[in-house]
């Protein structure tokens, strides 16, 4: 099994352009796939959690924020490798000893299942079929998100899986 | 200026070593994977090696595979690559590159000079 | 490992020449190729990614196409600067892998 790169990879400086471009559309910047409202970008190379955390920040967006079963789903059916694991914005706060999102919201209970230890430097991730904890130092890919916004003469293609 | 800027090279003979260095400047050293590429003399570029930002994964091509070693130095914004068992056949320039994106393996915009490493004896 | 064939490995054109370089992979990349351009005695140049997006500073006359195993570079009208050597490279799965090169030469 040769190790995937990745699904999606992102450029967002703002001074590349497609060979053959289009007019104004409300899409997602090159490599970020459109996922219902929302552009995901699955990283092709690996960080540990803070610099996976750090690196979507770099790009005007936040690591995956999950809000129900259904965008679980949505989410992991975008993996197409067993294999491949990636970061998403929730980690084990100590203080508050639960997991909360990056945003500052609090897992519930019926949200997520998470299988693994809920401890100090445990962060998640997703796979194709399961939610795991892991240290926080692991290095794994990751997945960014961002508010689909009016992108000028940047389109996507059709597909990037 | 944004810049890679190799060293190292030179002449070695058949099982001897070389460690070879990249030193950046004009960007954030530390969020990027860097990849080593080799070109022999007058022939195709060959991905060598590549490791993660963080420092903590790498991968290699099968031909150098238990013979050299890739890491890095994101304090002092250096990658190396340590060349053991050194054969004829990696007689070569090298170069470090950087890629497009830091969420990217490959698509290098920034490449360095190279440094030719030559095996004879 | 993917494999990247290139043809042709050499053609000779002519200033203000169209000049059209495949390259298919021996598997499904998707849109992850990039082409490079190198001149004798220098590094690699990118010129294109993910297929079809141009490089930053890359003139218009380049452009890029293709998806799943066949990909185009092709150069609108051959400027005296464009001869040189190109590479495409995939960046789908590890190892990453280059063609091997097709050198643009003076008719």
């Known amino acids: 099994q040769k190790p995937s790169i990745g699904k999606c990879s992102v450029d967002i400086q703002q001074n590349r352009t497609k060979t053959t471009e289009r007019p104004d559309l409300l899409n997602c910047p090159i490599y970020w796939q459109q996922v219902q409202e929302k552009c995901l970008l699955f990283s092709h190379t690996v960080n540990p959690w803070n610099n996976s955390l750090a690196d979507c920040s770099t790009k005007e967006s936040s690591l995956l924020l999950i809000q129900d079963k259904d965008e679980l789903t949505r989410t992991q059916n975008l993996i197409h490798d067993k294999a491949i694991s990636f970061w998403i914005g929730l980690n084990f706060s100590l203080s508050e000893k639960n997991w909360k999102w990056i945003n500052g919201s609090f897992l519930s209970s019926n949200d997520l299942k998470i299988t693994g230890d809920a401890k100090e430097n445990s962060c998640v991730y997703i796979s194709q079929t399961s939610v795991y904890s892991e240290y926080c130092s692991t290095e794994m890919k990751w997945i960014c998100q961002k508010e689909l916004t009016l992108v000028r003469n940047k389109v996507s293609p059709d597909s990037w899986l | 200026e944004v810049q890679l800027l190799e060293s190292g090279g030179g002449l070695v003979q058949p099982g001897g070593s070389l460690r070879l260095s990249c030193a950046a400047s004009g960007f954030t050293f530390g969020q990027y994977a860097m990849s080593w590429v080799r070109q022999a003399p007058g022939k195709g570029l060959e991905w060598v090696s590549a490791?993660?930002?963080?420092?903590?994964?790498?991968y290699y091509a099968d031909s150098v595979k238990g013979r050299f070693t890739i890491s890095r130095d994101n304090s002092k914004n250096t990658l190396y690559l340590q060349m053991n068992s050194l054969r004829a056949e990696d007689t070569a320039v090298y170069y470090c590159?950087?890629?497009?994106?830091?969420?990217?393996?490959?698509?290098?915009?920034?490449w360095g000079r190279g440094t030719l490493v030559t095996v004879s004896s | 490992d993917i494999q990247l064939t290139q043809s042709p490995s050499s053609v000779s054109a002519s200033v203000g020449d169209r000049v059209t370089i495949t390259c298919r992979a021996s598997q499904g990349i998707s849109s992850w190729l990039a082409w490079y351009q190198q001149k004798p005695g220098k590094a690699p140049k990118l010129l294109i990614y993910?297929?079809?997006f141009l490089q930053s500073g890359v003139p218009s006359r380049f452009s890029g196409s293709g998806s799943g195993t066949d990909f185009t570079l092709t150069i609108s009208s051959l400027q005296p600067e464009d001869f040189a050597t190109y590479y495409c490279?995939?960046?789908?799965?590890?190892?990453?892998?280059f063609g091997g090169g097709t050198k643009v030469e003076i008719k």
């Open positions: 993910a297929a079809s």
């Open positions: 490279q995939q960046a789908s799965v590890l190892p990453i892998t």
């Open positions: 490791i993660s930002a963080a420092g903590g994964t790498t």
């Open positions: 590159a950087k890629p497009l994106d830091s969420s990217q393996w490959a698509d290098f915009d920034l």
